[in-house]
Amino acid sequence: GCDRNCGLITGAVIGAVLAVFGGILMPVGDMLIQKTIKKEVVLEEGTIAFKNWVKTGTEIYRQFWIFDVQNPQEVMMNSSNIQVKQRGPYTYRVRFLAKENITQDPKDNTVSFLQPNGAIFEPSLSVGTEADNFTVLNLAVAAASHIYPNPFVQVVLNSLINKSKSSMFQVRTLRELLWGYTDPFLSLVPYPVSTRVGMFYPYNNTADGVYKVFNGKDSISKVAIIDTYKGKRNLSYWESYCDMINGTDAASFPPFVEKSQVLQFFSSDICRSIYAVFESDVNLKGIPVYRFVLPSKAFASPVQNPDNHCFCTEKIISKNCTSYGVLDISKCKEGKPVYISLPHFLYASPDVSETIDGLNPNEEEHRTYLDIEPITGFTLQFAKRLQVNLLVKPSNKIQVLKRLKRNYIVPILWLNETGTIGDEKAKMFRSQVTGKINLLGLIEMILLSVGVVMFVAFMISYCACRSKTIK
């Protein structure tokens, strides 16, 4: 009888030990994971994060859709609605260059760098060539008439516009429109001014920055968060807190991301910090990720969202700050009347798009999202969508703008910049991060389950044997 009882008690003890071990492994395992993650996401030589941070292993593409104006004469002569037809995608490979001038500063635990710009046309991913022609707004005419509202100078500009045979609209190739061309009107200015114009001019052989970001050595909760941009903590474009440089550059976030978090990031393309909120769980190539999206609230007017009051910088075009969905970034673009919006004026007020025909906003195609692996904080997939627009206003001194009866925020193009973790990288990520965490969780669950089952089973058997013996 003793042998059997001893065996049952031994089994129960082993079960209890296994269960306790499984239970202990949960916080200990989590601690080990946290320790490993904290070590590997620091931005310093030798870590996984640093290697991928210096040069992204993901192929990033920027697709452009150009808004081809169908009725330039009618607009110029009768102030008609502008009829646009989007043409694209025209795809470029971007962000393929490694970060430059990487300098660690041990004093304040930061790392500074420049992000070089480069774009390579991808014909196989495009609907046409860089030589395709488009009818678009005359960028120089629209910009110059806005920068110089002075009636005297507008007479001078009118003389140059007429002499150069420029008009309100122009025909340009894709390459010219994006990367720059010599403008005939600006070429007549008898002073040393930049005569090259382009939506992204200059781009190739330039760099964004200097960025100075926290490397996470002192506090992992600050990793990749921007300390300064171009040597400053503020942008000098906006009033109050709107001018702050918040969060990371969106390529990664501090680890252990929660669904309840509001992820702040700075985008130099839109000259402001913005934020994303959790939308849904997504499975990306076997990796569980959180999808964060830019909410419509971020583009709301100060009437709808008082937090946005400092992004309203003028009262006329914004109809006393009641318009929404467009951001005037002229201060960031040397006074050129550039307005940023989501493609097809998604989330924008009706008054913004009432002068434009041919737009079809659609949330799925036109919103911006980030797919973030929550444990590491790495952005494994993203789609950054934005539209670049130019304001053109009537001018009684400039002949080609004389017959306009209203202001137009003219869409020039929209872009979709995307990146998705490659299959090989995803496999590696699964085995090194997701796989190990899942395995540890499985072991914990097996130990706990087997231990509890053994303990309960052996204890029941032992009690049953005891009661039989007593009888």
């Epitope: 509202p149 005297f152 001078v156 003389s159």
Partner: antibody, heavy 117, light 107 residues
Framework: EVQLVESGGGLVQPGGSLRLSCAAS????????IHWVRQAPGKGLEWVAW????????YYADSVKGRFTISADTSKNTAYLQMNSLRAEDTAVYYC??????????WGQGTLVTVSS | DIQMTQSPSSLSASVGDRVTITCRAS??????VAWYQQKPGKAPKLLIS???SLYSGVPSRFSGSGSGTDFTLTISSLQPEDFATYYC?????????FGQGTKVEIK
């Protein structure tokens, strides 16, 4: 070196005419546009006329509208001010000046026009 | 037409003095104001454009300020060669107009 040289001033009777010339060197007048500014003896400066770049447009002070005409000969790089129906109050030193954005960065030495019987 | 009202019409100052001349536009001209110096028998010389931008070759003791309707020309330390008449001019709208001038004389 940028230079502007006025000529053609002199004594003229009321109702008479005079043509002032402004010869430019060191720049192309058509690119900038030329202004005429006058200064009556012991008085301040008064803007008179302007020909916009590339002969785009001509503007005149109300006091001379319909009597004065500004023109330019790009082949000679010279601007002119044709003054008709001259009055005693037109007596002044006439300067031609170069301007693009409306301020005058180069001035001629001036030519005196005296309207007197 | 935009009227430019300069004050004072004349002032007496000594070498080394700080001199301030003001100019008021009858309507908003933003920063489209120029300042000139003229000596007897000579053509005017540009000192400042866009209200604050010092023209090349002009000594740094000259400075301009203001925007909208009120503008100021300041000579931080008057030099013997600065005794002359000074004019403001708006270059915002045709007809271009000048102030009536401020004569700076030796005290």
């Amino acid at each position: 070196e940028v230079q502007l040289v006025e000529s053609g001033g002199g004594l003229v009777q009321p109702g008479g005419s005079l043509r002032l010339s402004c010869a430019a060197s060191g720049f192309t007048i058509s690119s900038f546009g030329i202004h005429w500014v006058r200064q009556a003896p012991g008085k301040g400066l008064e803007w008179v006329a302007w020909i916009a770049p590339y002969g785009g447009e001509e503007y005149y002070a109300d006091s001379v509208k319909g009597r004065f005409t500004i023109s330019a000969d790009t082949s000679k790089n010279t601007a002119y001010l044709q003054m008709n129906s001259l009055r005693a109050e037109d007596t002044a030193v006439y300067y031609c000046a170069r301007s693009f954005f409306g301020y005058f960065d180069y001035w001629g030495q001036g030519t005196l026009v005296t309207v007197s019987s | 037409d935009i009227q430019m009202t300069q004050s004072p019409s004349s002032l007496s100052a000594s070498v080394g003095d700080r001199v301030t001349i003001t100019c008021r536009a009858s309507q908003d001209v933003s920063n489209w104001v120029a300042w000139y110096q003229q000596k007897p028998g000579k053509a005017p010389k540009l000192l400042i454009s866009y209200a604050t931008s010092l023209y090349s070759g002009v000594p740094s003791r000259f400075s301009g300020s203001g925007s909208g309707t009120d503008f100021t020309l300041t000579i931080s330390s008057l030099q013997p060669e600065d005794f002359a008449t000074y004019y403001c001019q708006q270059h915002s709208n045709a007809p271009l107009t000048f102030g009536q001038g401020t004569k700076v004389e030796i005290k």
